[in-house]
């Protein structure tokens, strides 16, 4: 009889432990759900607010038609400038038309005055041809005005309203370009 009681007591004890575990799991699960809910709400909030505030260009970028431009506040050599633009999901500026050139030079005059700014133009060492970074050729009116007397690689830059060339290892400001976001409204 005593043995039977002690077996029942042990079973009850086991049941109690299992229930405690279940309660603990439930509490943990509830906490996890609450955290997930909080995360989801925050995520939704961010998405909604960014959708609400979505401007065609990021902060500190300038818009013109379908493009956004970033004028750097630091100097770097041409290759580092290229990487700095890539980090921002953009490429070095590629000037497609005289209108775009006029917009850029006009904006630079307002922002900084007469400094040198790397653009995505470089000269092929073998052929001497000027090419934009995507491999396309500049239009005839957008070729650098002077040939750099450099044995090193030569890259293009904008100064005042001219496109010029220089040794790619010199330090200059730079301009990045990306596409403007289309408004979904």
């Amino acid at each position: 009889k005593l043995l039977q009681v002690s077996t029942i007591a042990m079973q009850q004890q086991e049941k109690l432990i299992q229930q405690e575990r279940a309660l603990l799991n439930f509490t943990e699960w509830k906490r996890s759900c609450a955290l997930q809910m909080k995360y989801c709400q925050a995520f939704m909030q961010n998405s909604l607010s960014s959708a609400h505030n979505s401007s065609p260009c990021p902060n500190n970028w300038i818009q013109n038609r379908e493009s956004c431009y970033y004028v750097s506040e630091i100097w770097s050599i041409w290759h580092t400038s290229q990487e700095n633009c890539l980090k921002e999901g953009s490429t070095l500026l590629q000037i497609e038309s005289k209108e775009e050139m006029d917009f850029i030079t006009g904006s630079l005059r307002k922002i900084k005055g007469s400094y040198d700014y790397w653009v995505g133009l470089s000269q092929d060492g073998h052929s001497g041809r000027w090419l934009w970074q995507d491999g396309s050729s500049p239009s005839p009116g957008l070729l650098p005005a002077e040939r750099s007397q450099s044995a090193n690689q030569v890259c293009g830059y904008v100064k005042s309203n001219s496109l010029l060339s220089s040794n790619c290892s010199t330090w200059k400001y730079f301009i990045c370009e990306k596409y403007a976001l289309r408004s979904s409204v």
């Epitope: 890539l86 980090k87 921002e88 999901g89 953009s90 490429t91 491999g135 370009e177 990306k178």
Partner: nanobody, 115 residues
């Protein structure tokens, strides 16, 4: 954390073609700029080509007109199509993910062009 894995390297004759792939696991690649770099023995690692999340492309002068970078967001993969290969293209090719806060690299794939 994003894991990048390159594939498609190998031995090819001068004038031949190869297509390298850079596949990602751990996160979607679609919001990142992805670049292909290469490093030949005794030389510095150099940028070969890159493609932004918007599809803007940039190429090194030495590969313009021969290499093409593209991306397939559905497959979470970026490709480098290499045509008219030259012996100077021999190197280990790496892909790199760019973001404003951090960069991440793959392990690399060897490309050997024999003349």
């Amino acid at each position: 954390q994003v894991q990048l894995q390159e594939s498609g390297g190998g031995l090819v004759q001068a004038g031949g073609s190869l297509r390298l792939s850079c596949a990602a696991s751990g996160r979607t690649l679609s919001s990142y700029t992805i670049g292909w770099y290469r490093q030949a023995p005794g030389k510095q690692r150099e940028l070969v080509a890159a493609i932004t999340n918007q599809g803007r492309r940039t190429y090194a002068d030495s590969v313009k007109g021969r290499f093409t970078i593209s991306r397939d967001n559905a497959k979470n993969t970026v490709y480098l199509q290499m045509d008219s290969l030259k012996s100077e293209d021999t190197a280990v090719y790496y892909c790199k993910g760019f973001s404003p806060t951090d960069d991440f690299w793959g392990q690399g794939t060897q490309v050997t062009v024999s003349s």
